[in-house]
Amino acid sequence: EVEKTACPSGKKAREIDESLIFYKKWELEACVDAALLATQMDRVNAIPFTYEQLDVLKHKLDELYPQGYPESVIQHLGYLFLKMSPEDIRKWNVTSLETLKALLEVNKGHEMSPQVATLIDRFVKGRGQLDKDTLDTLTAFYPGYLCSLSPEELSSVPPSSIWAVRPQDLDTCDPRQLDVLYPKARLAFQNMNGSEYFVKIQSFLGGAPTEDLKALSQQNVSMDLATFMKLRTDAVLPLTVAEVQKLLGPHVEGLKAEERHRPVRDWILRQRQDDLDTLGLGLQGGIPNGYLVLDLSMQEALS
């Protein structure tokens, strides 16, 4: 808190300019009019203030706008944004994507701060949903943004926005998140032809059910092992050896290296050993020949 002192003679700021960098903190407090600062916020970021000085300017804006800054000021905060607390940001009403971009630019190249997280939350809630332009912007600045959302929050993403998602945006998503995103992606890409469809849907397949994997196996997609290993175990288990062979195409040889890892390990345990032998990969652990396989889940469903 800067103590109130009279502005020295001749030091009253008539405009926000570089001469102010030579003002002591108390002089900034005494000699800069808050209303002038608010109308000339666009100049502040170009002036090499210290953060101590920016703290004083923030204090002046806080006094002028105790209920929260108007967007005309927020848009031009620049590095002053770094001095804002999440509590400050919760008072804002940010509606312009340009404002959001300007503030994200300040934090570019760094992990998402609590301030940025609060800003994004306020912005998205204000819009009511994660539209394509917003998602485009957020994933450009924070590739992991989508995977930071809860399944409930992801449910507000319209299928049209899925076009903005790049494979790397889904790297840290867990199965629960992919369960929500996959049906949206399926809807978004439904009018594409086979090979183009697979390229787009591939990153979302961690949320795909068995029937969709069976359908893909009929389309010569040649799924790579990295994608296969991210599939839901419960979706992979019912696939036959022939279906997996068709799904993976030439990549089927990679199963041997993954035979001890899920979902491959669990899938092997469900297959007849003689079926596995047809692959010629030396996969072991299947059901020995002559054993009867009872599908207890089916039996329970019928009773």
């Epitope: 210290t50 953060y51 590095y79 760094h110």
Partner: nanobody, 116 residues
């Protein structure tokens, strides 16, 4: 974190000269270049001179024409050449910069005393 170390302070007579150095322990990523600040006894910290990332220099009115700020990137060092020193230049001199994350950094300071 990069360390800032000032040197070159001392006692000098009015009209004399001193050259202050500020060495950084590594490359700094500064939002506002490097500044020389001073704090006289019982007074607030004030900026004396600043050299921006593009080499632009800026001076407080009280030192214009007497002080010169410069830098040697190969040595990670910023200098303040102080000529025609006056009694009112007596202070602890600090170098400092602001990063891109909301923090100001300062050295430990070097004392300059102008006295006859």
């Amino acid at each position: 974190q990069v360390q800032l170390v000032e040197s070159g302070g001392g006692v000098v007579q009015p009209g004399g000269s001193l050259r202050l150095s500020c060495a950084t322990s590594g490359t700094i990523f500064s939002r506002n270049g490097m500044g020389w600040f001073r704090q006289a006894p019982g007074k607030g910290l004030e900026l004396v001179a600043r050299i921006l990332n593009d080499g632009t220099t800026m001076y407080a009115d009280s030192v214009k024409g007497r002080f010169t700020i410069s830098r040697d990137n190969s040595k990670n060092t910023v200098y303040l050449q102080m000529n025609s020193l006056r009694a009112e230049d007596t202070a602890v001199y600090y170098c400092g910069y602001s990063d891109y994350r909301g923090t100001d950094y300062w050295g430990q300071g070097t004392q300059v005393t102008v006295s006859s």
